[in-house]
């Protein structure tokens, strides 16, 4: 969390941003909130990016003002116009690219004063893994697949029964480049699996950590997966 203040005493307002990550090829949100004003027409929101000459986005007098917008963001940004009045200056970013990573500044002017806060935005690819029993294999084998990751993640297997065990000798992980030549499909196979046990396939890079669990018993198979972004720090 980054909290920024205006420059001088009573003419400053608090602006808060949250560091976040964008999944390339999808929508991203750059989060920013501020002390609200009662009049929409008095609020100015400017989003800037370090190293970019034009603005990322500007909203003033109740509408978007894009005359100063940098070409790389044209048609790719929008604020949540109906939420500006309650202090939400967050920016929606279309079709996140690797080049969108960097330091952004959310700069706010209201009738109460000015304020700004920086936001670190990371970009990459992350997806939920799915763990299945590989019935084609000669022995009891689990297969963990996740369609899109970048940068290349690490994959670690764990088991509820054999906590702390190192499965690197009995697993094999491969990374296959996807058609757009950036992201990769992650496939990891775990051999010599025993029933009545829960196995976890953990995939992690510097942006996200995802886990796929599978519980194999004689009567059923239960699966669960979750994903967590690693750099959601507020400022």
């Amino acid at each position: 969390l980054i909290i920024g203040f205006g420059i001088s005493g009573r003419h400053s307002i608090t602006v808060t941003t949250v560091a976040s990550a964008g999944n390339i090829g999808e929508d991203g949100i750059l989060s920013c909130t501020f002390e609200p004003d009662i009049k929409l027409s008095d609020i100015v929101i400017q989003w800037l990016k370090e190293g970019v000459l034009g603005l990322v986005h500007e909203f003033k007098e109740g509408k978007d003002e894009l005359s100063e917008q940098d070409e790389m963001f044209r048609g790719r940004t929008a604020v949540f116009a109906d939420q500006v009045i309650v202090g939400n200056a967050s920016l929606r970013l279309k079709n996140v690219q690797l080049t969108d990573a960097g330091t952004y500044k959310c700069y706010i002017i209201t009738s109460k004063g000015k304020g700004n806060a920086n936001l670190e935005y990371k970009t990459g690819a992350f997806s939920m893994p799915e763990v299945n029993v590989d019935y084609n294999a000669s022995s009891e084998t689990l297969r963990c697949e996740a369609p899109r990751w970048f940068p290349q993640p690490t994959v670690v297997w764990a088991s509820q029964v054999d906590q702390g065990a190192n499965f690197s000798e009995v697993s094999n992980t491969s990374f296959e480049l996807n058609s757009e030549n950036v992201t990769m499909k992650v496939v990891s196979v775990l051999y010599n699996v025993t029933i009545n046990n829960t196995y976890s396939c953990m995939i992690e890079n510097d942006i996200a950590k995802a886990t796929g669990d599978i519980k194999v018993t004689e009567s059923e198979i239960k699966r669960r997966s979750h994903l967590q972004l690693l750099n959601s720090k507020a400022s």
């Epitope: 509408k63 978007d64 894009l66 048609g75």
Partner: antibody
Framework: EVQLVQSGAEVKKPGASVKVSCKAS????????IGWVRQAPGQGLEWIGD????????NYNEKFKGRATLTADTSTSTAYLELSSLRSEDTAVYYC??????????????WGQGTLVTVSS | DIQMTQSPSSLSASVGDRVTITCKAS??????VAWYQQKPGKAPKLLIH???TLQPGVPSRFSGSGSGRDYTLTISSLQPEDFATYYC?????????FGQGTKVEIK
């Protein structure tokens, strides 16, 4: 309610130009992109380009660059498509459509009724 | 430019059938694929955007899915009013592109 009302049918000779209008109502005209799409008789949809009336920014399908001109008059909330050097294969229904997402260029969510342009000698 | 290859170009089906239409993008990955329904003499109608998000008022028998370069529109149980032509649209890049269309006819 978002409404896009287009101008009437046109008959033009090869080599001439045509200007189709699209009058918008029910939303803030300057805050949304407007796209243009055409459909030749019995054929599929073909994207021509789009314009952001709030700044006059445009994007064009390479096929129409230099022949299509997109403009917008914010005082009347009207978008225009002008197509020059017409040929018989330009005979089509021309649609305008609002792009979802305000300044963010989304999918086309509201459409005009279409304008038939016939090019014939 | 990204091209969208839609298949099949036409299909015959009966009321109650499950119908699947696919679009393949020539390159890249993004979720910005929309699906439209068009009836003769009418403007296209947006059914689905962002791969799988249903437009308000569109029946839940319509669904969208896909990732990478492959995207699918599914009609779970075809109704008489669903006989029409369907188009996919790629709108993630600077230049938009429609698929060639799929005509769904009565068997």
């Amino acid at each position: 309610e978002v409404q896009l009302v287009q101008s009437g049918a046109e008959v033009k000779k090869p080599g001439a130009s045509v200007k189709v209008s699209c009058k918008a109502s029910g939303y803030t005209f300057t805050s949304y992109w407007i796209g243009w799409v055409r459909q030749a008789p019995g054929q599929g949809l073909e994207w021509i380009g789009d314009i952001y009336p709030g700044g006059g920014y445009t994007n064009y399908n390479e096929k129409f660059k230099g022949r299509a001109t997109l403009t917008a008059d914010t005082s009347t909330s009207t978008a225009y498509l002008e197509l020059s050097s017409l040929r018989s294969e330009d005979t089509a229904v021309y649609y305008c459509a609002r792009l979802d997402g305000s300044s963010y260029r989304g999918a086309m969510d509201s459409w005009g009724q279409g304008t038939l342009v016939t090019v014939s000698s | 430019d990204i091209q969208m290859t839609q298949s099949p170009s036409s299909l015959s089906a009966s009321v109650g059938d499950r119908v699947t239409i696919t679009c393949k993008a020539s390159q890249g990955f993004n979720k910005y694929v929309a699906w439209y329904q068009q009836k003769p003499g009418k403007a296209p109608k947006l059914l689905i955007h962002y791969t799988s998000t249903l437009q308000p008022g569109v029946p839940s028998r319509f669904s969208g899915s896909g990732s990478g370069r492959d995207y699918t529109l599914t009609i779970s149980s075809l109704q008489p009013e669903d006989f029409a032509t369907y188009y996919c649209l790629q709108y993630g890049n600077l230049l938009y592109a429609f698929g060639q269309g799929t005509k769904v006819e009565i068997k």
